[in-house]
Interface confidence: medium
């Protein structure tokens, strides 16, 4: 991956095809690297990242990483090659059209990561397909 502010162009020397033999063009992903976030205890969140970027390589997918510790919450949005680990974790869900967050074990923090392969799919990060709607504000008082 390369920083989002760098203008990206397709490398025509490296033509990648999907399983059907069709030419695979670079994916569009939200790419803001690490930003502070207010996303917490919600079914899903928008990334609030205003930078949409074509990934550097056609095989790269969109990734989002949500982290919470004592001091802050951050959301990272990037492109990444699913053949390579990210934050020491394999991107198991790289073929998913949606970015469904999965918790990963990291000492001293709460760490969720998702990957997906539709354009800008890391703009909407999903933590739970089913979430309490009865009185979320009161739950925040108790647990957050």
């Amino acid at each position: 991956t390369i920083p989002p502010h760098v203008q990206k162009s397709v490398n025509n020397d490296m033509i990648v095809t999907d399983n059907n033999g069709a030419v695979k063009f670079p994916q569009l992903c939200k790419f803001c690297d690490v930003r502070f976030s207010t996303c917490d205890n919600q079914k899903s969140c928008m990334s609030n990242c205003s930078i949409t970027s074509a990934c550097e390589k056609p095989q790269e997918v969109c990734v989002a990483v949500w982290r919470k510790n004592d001091e802050n919450i951050t959301l990272e949005t990037v492109c990444h090659d699913p053949k390579l680990p990210y934050h020491d974790f394999i991107l198991e869900d790289a073929a998913s059209p949606k970015c469904i967050m999965k918790e990963k074990k990291k000492p001293g923090e709460t760490f969720f990561m998702c990957s997906c392969s539709s354009d800008e799919c890391n703009d909407n990060i999903i933590f739970s397909e089913e979430y309490n709607t009865s009185n979320p504000d009161l739950l925040l008082v108790i647990f957050q």
Partner: antibody, heavy 121, light 107 residues
Framework: QVQLVESGGGLVQPGGSLRLSCAVS????????MSWVRQAPGKGLEWVSA????????HNTDSVKGRFSISRDNSKNTLYLQMNSLRAEDTAVYFC??????????????WGQGTLVTVSS | DIQMTQSPSSLSASVGDRVTITCRAS??????LNWYQQKPGKAPKLLIY???SLQSGVPSRFSGSGSGTDFTLTISSLQPEDFATYYC?????????FGQGTKVEIK
């Protein structure tokens, strides 16, 4: 290491008052919601009261509404429970607990060792 | 309020036994279910959160499963230090409510 230490329990007559404290160390107190959970002798656990991280919002279980008041002093890393108009059924060990929230999960961890409140004449 | 019902209320088992405790919610709570262990005179200790996630430092012999209304805590091979009371707790809606507890005793 994380520690929550309750104090202020004791014997009080029905209708009396008591103020419990929970002194916290080992984590950034101002970042977390806190709760009081009680356990009557030989019985199960009952959530009593909670306060948001900043202290601007509170919530109580129905049986203590109008009688118990939860508060916190983030500069002193201390949680309080002011208990008024005490009844015999309020007799219990009172635990303070840290609330944890992240998307998709909510739980209490860790807990203090508890302080015993006995309401009896 | 959501009612949480545990079964059995008590059980006797031997070291090495596989122990299963169930918890049923009066309505669907998705996976917002936690399990705590409590020993006499001590504070509850978190074992499992979000139905199946093992809390850091908890031995792997403890596991949780289920979603919706039916949940299970399993101890794969009971150890002497596991004799205690176990509580489930829902955190899906306020007020958070606990099961009545399951006491695991030595046979």
């Amino acid at each position: 290491q994380v520690q929550l230490v309750e104090s202020g329990g004791g014997l009080v007559q029905p209708g009396g008052s008591l103020r419990l404290s929970c002194a916290v160390s080992g984590f950034t107190f101002r970042r977390y919601a806190m709760s009081w959970v009680r356990q009557a002798p030989g019985k199960g656990l009952e959530w009593v009261s909670a306060i948001s991280a900043s202290g601007d919002r509170t919530h109580n279980t129905d049986s203590v509404k109008g009688r118990f008041s939860i508060s916190r002093d983030n500069s002193k890393n201390t949680l309080y429970l002011q208990m008024n108009s005490l009844r015999a059924e309020d007799t219990a060990v009172y635990f303070c607990a840290k609330g944890i929230a992240a998307s998709g999960k909510n739980y209490f961890d860790p807990w203090g060792q508890g302080t015993l409140v006995t309401v009896s004449s | 309020d959501i009612q949480m019902t545990q079964s059995p209320s008590s059980l006797s088992a031997s070291v090495g036994d596989r122990v299963t405790i169930t918890c049923r919610a009066s309505q669907s709570i998705s996976s917002y279910l936690n399990w705590y262990q409590q020993k006499p005179g001590k504070a509850p200790k978190l074992l499992i959160y979000a139905a199946s996630s093992l809390q850091s430092g908890v031995p792997s012999r403890f596991s949780g499963s289920g979603s919706g209304t039916d949940f299970t805590l399993t101890i794969s091979s009971l150890q002497p230090e596991d004799f205690a009371t176990y509580y489930c707790q829902q955190s899906y809606s306020t007020p958070p409510t606990f099961g009545q507890g399951t006491k695991v005793e030595i046979k």
